[in-house]
């Protein structure tokens, strides 16, 4: 006879029908309390209505309780990231209960079938939480559900079905297919917990987006724009992660959300900051490095609860591996030009010199195009903490080697063969550190020498306090 399981009746693996020789059909969701940091330890299995394992395995009723929820699986085994996450949680929160939700039999199916099983698994987790709430000292506010991919939506269902409100849900690159644009009750949403934070690492506006693009939490963080993750290119995975195929690139980018979260647990001294911004392009332009009015936040475990925000999109750059932290800088550069330089865009690099270290030659990424006789904003980032910025060097490498630019160069030459070499005038650069929120203005050492041409460099030093331009005839007055 069928074993009842939650509101949906018996769970049956649609791909693998249980054999007749099996004496019983087990529910396909179980809860493994990880009692040791040792990944080889089998842990303890908890089940609703059985209090003995809670006592035997020293479940701490007053401590934080983490539920880790895996996603769809092609192999039917726990993936390697899971053990890293368990270990990191144990390292950071020594007294916490870490529970792995094992729904492998229901996840090891066609993706569409696994999606259809998410609701039932969410119910199962909610039942477990409802039962734990009957125990003295257990608080739903101490519960943190961490769901990866399809598991993020399972967490959403669990938060929706539980009696009360769970403290926090973290969605690690929530699954996109069949959830993008879905109704609020059929996917992870801010209503599912007191605080819902989300990391999006594999979103694509073209082709299949493995991760969900839309914001689904109180805060939605898009590292590196939420799409191409450093260290996950085909060239990178060829050399390091298994075999360099598109599948591995997808896995690398999708799983990056987990590693960013693990990083936030184990590298407390190197917290990554994200900055609120309306879209990725504006962030790439360097416009969004403000921390005013809660516009910046830590990412991952250290994210500060922001319940007043909803679907707040936040961005940051990261390194290719742990620790992922980088240091963001906004550069405001006023560029003046005497002559019309056509549509060609200068290829500019900046090197930052600090009290602790010097940066590499950093490209000033032109997101749209440089506006002449206007202030342009750029985003640059460094992997090292440079300390206090002391000086900087701007280099013009000449035109970018695109056919479009080469054609424009040729066209400009034909129309103005006597045109002097192209020249930009940059008198000062205003720098703001995203991490410290400090602003510093850098000036050219000699105000009369502020021009730069292809193949040249221009040095900037901290402007002296109260420094004013004395030469009133200069074309730069009131421009910067």
């Amino acid at each position: 006879s069928p074993v009842p399981f939650g509101p949906e009746g018996r769970l049956e693996d649609k791909l693998h029908k249980p054999k007749a020789t099996q004496t019983e059909v087990k529910p396909s969701v179980r809860f493994n309390l990880r009692t040791s940091k040792d990944p080889e330890h089998e842990g303890c299995y908890l089940s609703v209505g059985h209090s003995q394992p809670l006592e035997d395995c020293s479940f701490n009723m007053t401590a934080k309780t983490f539920f880790i929820i895996h996603g769809w699986t092609m192999s039917g085994i726990f993936e390697n990231w899971l053990h890293k996450l368990v270990s990191a949680l144990h390292t950071r929160e020594k007294d916490a209960n870490v529970v792995v939700v094992d729904w492998l039999p229901l996840a090891h199916q066609l993706y569409t079938d696994a999606v259809n099983n998410t609701r039932v698994v969410g119910h199962s987790i909610a039942r477990m939480l409802d039962w734990l709430q009957e125990k003295d000292d257990f608080s739903l506010g101490n519960v943190h559900l961490i769901g990866y991919s399809l598991g993020a939506h399972v967490a959403g269902y669990a938060g929706n079905f539980v009696k009360g409100t769970v403290g926090r849900i973290t969605g690690l690159d929530p699954a996109g297919p069949m959830f993008e644009g879905a109704d609020i009750h059929k996917r992870l949403s801010p209503d599912d917990a007191d605080f819902v934070d989300v990391l999006h690492t594999y979103t694509r506006s073209f082709g299949l987006s493995i991760g969900i693009q839309m914001p689904v939490g109180h805060i939605d963080i898009y590292p590196n724009g939420g799409d191409f993750q450093p260290g996950c290119g085909l060239n990178d995975v060829l050399g390091s992660i298994a075999y360099g195929t598109i599948t591995e690139v997808v896995k690398c980018e999708h799983e990056r959300a987990v590693h960013l979260f693990v990083d936030s647990l184990v590298n407390q001294d190197k917290p990554s900051f994200a900055f609120q911004c309306t879209d990725s392009n504006r962030f790439k332009k360097g416009i969004c490095l403000s921390c005013r009015k809660n516009r910046c936040n830590n990412i991952g475990y250290n994210a500060k609860k922001m319940r007043k925000k909803r679907n707040s999109k936040m961005y940051l750059k990261t390194r290719a591996g742990m620790p992922f932290k980088v240091y963001h800088y906004q550069l405001k550069v006023h560029m003046f030009s005497y002559n019309n330089s056509g549509d060609t865009q200068p290829t500019l690099y900046i090197t930052l010199y600090g009290s602790n270290a010097d940066s590499q030659n950093l490209p000033l990424e032109i997101v749209e195009k440089i506006e002449l006789n206007a202030t342009n904003t750029f985003l640059v980032y460094t992997e090292e903490d440079l300390g206090d910025l002391l000086k900087m060097r701007l280099t013009w490498e000449g035109v970018a080697h695109s056919w479009y630019n080469l054609w424009n160069e040729f066209r400009n030459y034909l129309s103005q063969p006597s045109n002097p070499s192209r020249e930009l005038y940059i008198r000062r650069i205003r720098v703001k550190s995203g991490e410290t929120q400090r602003k510093v203005t850098f000036c050219t050492q000699d105000p009369t020498k502020s021009s730069i041409s292809p193949g040249q460099e221009l040095w900037f030093h901290k402007c002296q306090d109260g420094w004013k331009m004395k030469n009133k005839t200069s074309p730069f007055v009131n421009l910067a």
Partner: antibody, heavy 120, light 111 residues
Framework: QVQLVQSGAEVKKPGASVKVSCKAS????????MNWVRQAPGQGLEWMGW????????TYAGDFKGRFTFTLDTSTSTAYMELSSLRSEDTAVYYC?????????????WGKGTTVTVSS | EIVMTQSPATLSVSPGERATLSCKAS??????????MHWYQQKPGQAPRLLIY???NLASGIPARFSGSGSGTEFTLTISSLQSEDFAVYYC?????????FGGGTKVEIK
Amino acid sequence: QVQLVQSGAEVKKPGASVKVSCKASGYTFTNYGMNWVRQAPGQGLEWMGWINTYSGVPTYAGDFKGRFTFTLDTSTSTAYMELSSLRSEDTAVYYCARRGYYGRRYFDVWGKGTTVTVSS
Amino acid sequence: EIVMTQSPATLSVSPGERATLSCKASQSVDYDVDSYMHWYQQKPGQAPRLLIYAASNLASGIPARFSGSGSGTEFTLTISSLQSEDFAVYYCQQTIEDPPTFGGGTKVEIK
């Protein structure tokens, strides 16, 4: 102590079927997956697949799909491997070996092996 | 699937000598700082026995003369001073992804 006890040697004719058992003791049967490994005479080790001892879901390696069936009887902590339509090339020693669901999934406990001989 | 290649196929060593066995994977079997590489010993007529797990960890009850090293795609099993009971076939195995695959084995025989 932890051990896996396998059924005795079998001699079968081509086209027949064989069912090898593997009885576990000394640990909680459903807390570890059960693997099946084949070793043909004078050859190396070949992973055939495994069964999730909690859910009963089997996974078969590429070359072992079709004629091979993994089943369980959790009441007796026993795993079974059944092979139908036997051929001479199925002559081998068949091992069961447990692996954890967590960690690095190595095979830490092995049965002594069951020799299956297919001969006309 | 990941292909494991062991060398040499046969190693002739005198008792008391050091034996070094090599195993190469067709792709990395590392995940972060962990290596999903294991070594087994098999004597004639017996089942394999786990010797080393995760590249360098000694399994329960295994003598300290056995040691494992390596990362990425290249791994080594070392027997510091061969005893008579160590003459056997040694297999390496990866479990970073399914299917778990074994190397072809290295037979350590008496010289």
